[in-house]
């Protein structure tokens, strides 16, 4: 790391080290030999989250309901607003600037992980012995019915999209 001219939480201006403004405040005027750095608190709906020499605070993020967004955590003078998505939707990026509807898992696929406000549904193909016959954002793959436990026999084999069909035992068999 290269050497720095100033202490931590200071900056160099006009060959002199001045104190940075603390989080939640913006720079009004640099220090001089006789005066300290002048800082002012950020206004309503503004923030600065680091020690800084910014002359303008950043605007809080707007969680636009038209994009499916809502406020997860209200911003302060030191933190930005955190947006999340309405129920049934998830963010399209880490910054959560817009939302998309949770994906449904097609027949033959089940839900491995239910979607959250920030991640989409994760689907997995139904393995042998399991099926899903619906398009759903919640349903897991279901196990095929066990005909034997019902004293029945398999009349039609199951697939990844259909359950087995059970029927009565063939009484003519010895």
């Amino acid at each position: 790391e290269p050497p720095t001219a100033c202490r931590e939480k200071q900056y160099l201006i006009n060959s002199q080290c001045c104190s940075l403004c603390q989080p939640g405040q913006k720079l009004v005027s640099d220090c001089t030999e006789f005066t300290e750095t002048e800082c002012l608190p950020c206004g309503e709906s503004e923030f600065l989250d680091t020690w800084n020499r910014e002359t303008h605070c950043h605007q809080h993020k707007y969680c636009d309901p038209n994009l499916g967004l809502r406020v997860q955590q209200k911003g302060t003078s030191e933190t930005d607003t955190i947006c999340t998505c309405e129920e049934g939707w998830h963010c399209t990026s880490e910054a959560c600037e817009s939302c998309v509807l949770h994906r449904s898992c097609s027949p033959g696929f089940g839900v491995k992980q239910i979607a959250t406000g920030v991640s989409d549904t994760i689907c997995e193909p139904c393995p042998v012995g399991f099926f899903s016959n619906v398009s759903s954002a919640f349903e897991k793959c279901h196990p095929w019915t066990s005909c034997e436990t019902k004293d029945l026999v398999v009349q039609q084999a199951g697939t990844n999209k259909t359950d087995v069909v059970c029927g009565p035992q063939d009484r003519l068999r010895a």
Epitope: P3, T4, E8, L12, S15, Q16, C17, E33, T35, T37
Partner: antibody
């Protein structure tokens, strides 16, 4: 009362490393930058760098960049200075020196040393 | 880096004399300057900081003045215990730099 007690004298061969310790007592260790200053025999004072014991942040003089490492152990209020790849011209008395309290200074770096360790003589000789 | 030039490099004086040491910075350092006294085999001792503020416990015969690039340390009436080497140090920006020292010797 404030005291900075340094480790004892060291004799090292060229190319070796040395690690000097500086144990602080009598004040809040984390509240003051600790600097290291050296003085070659019969010569003046040379600033090496500082460590902020609170954050662990460091700042080294360009001359020592890549060769010096300053660390601290706040649990025992001790600062360390390690110098690698020693040369004969590194023979000097090494001092730790306490800075003004953090937050004392708003303009300038205001690094004035009100307390010093007793010094550690490091001799580099083959 | 800011260069600090001290003069003279040595001065011979008698007890009771007024001694003046100067320090010049290669660029303006406002009032961010300190003066130290060092005796043989000992660590330096802070005398003055921010160019003119006397460190607690330092006798009032020591005084400092100046700002910008030119600074002065004055010992108004030299005492036997004042025979030592004196260093100036700029505290405006890192890297901190010291003057080459002024040795005050007995005439």
């Amino acid at each position: 009362q404030v005291q900075l007690v340094q480790s004892g004298a060291e004799v090292k061969k060229p190319g070796a490393s040395v690690k000097v310790s500086c144990k602080a007592s009598g004040y809040a260790f984390a509240g003051f930058y600790m600097h290291w200053v050296r003085q070659a025999p019969g010569q003046g004072l040379e600033w090496m760098g500082w460590i902020n014991p609170d954050s662990g942040g460091t700042n080294y003089a360009q001359k020592f960049q890549g060769r010096v490492t300053m660390t601290r152990d706040t649990s025992i209020s001790t600062a360390y200075m390690e110098l690698n790849r020693l040369r004969s011209d590194d023979t000097a008395v090494y001092y730790c020196a306490r800075d003004q309290p953090l937050g004392y200074c708003t303009n300038g770096v205001c690094s004035y040393f009100d307390y010093w360790g007793q010094g550690t003589l490091v001799t580099v000789s083959s | 880096d800011i260069q600090m030039t001290q003069s003279p490099s040595s001065v011979s004086a008698s007890v009771g004399d007024r001694v003046t040491i100067t320090c010049r910075a290669s660029q303006g350092i406002y009032s961010w300057l300190a003066w130290y006294q060092q005796k043989p085999g000992k660590a330096p001792n802070l005398l003055i900081y921010t160019a003119s503020t006397l460190q607690s416990g330092v006798p009032s015969r020591f005084s400092g003045s100046g700002s910008g690039t030119d600074f002065t340390l004055t010992i108004s009436s030299l005492q036997p215990e004042d025979f030592a080497t004196y260093y100036c140090q700029q505290a405006n920006i890192f890297p901190l730099t010291f003057g080459g020292g002024t040795k005050v010797e007995i005439k």
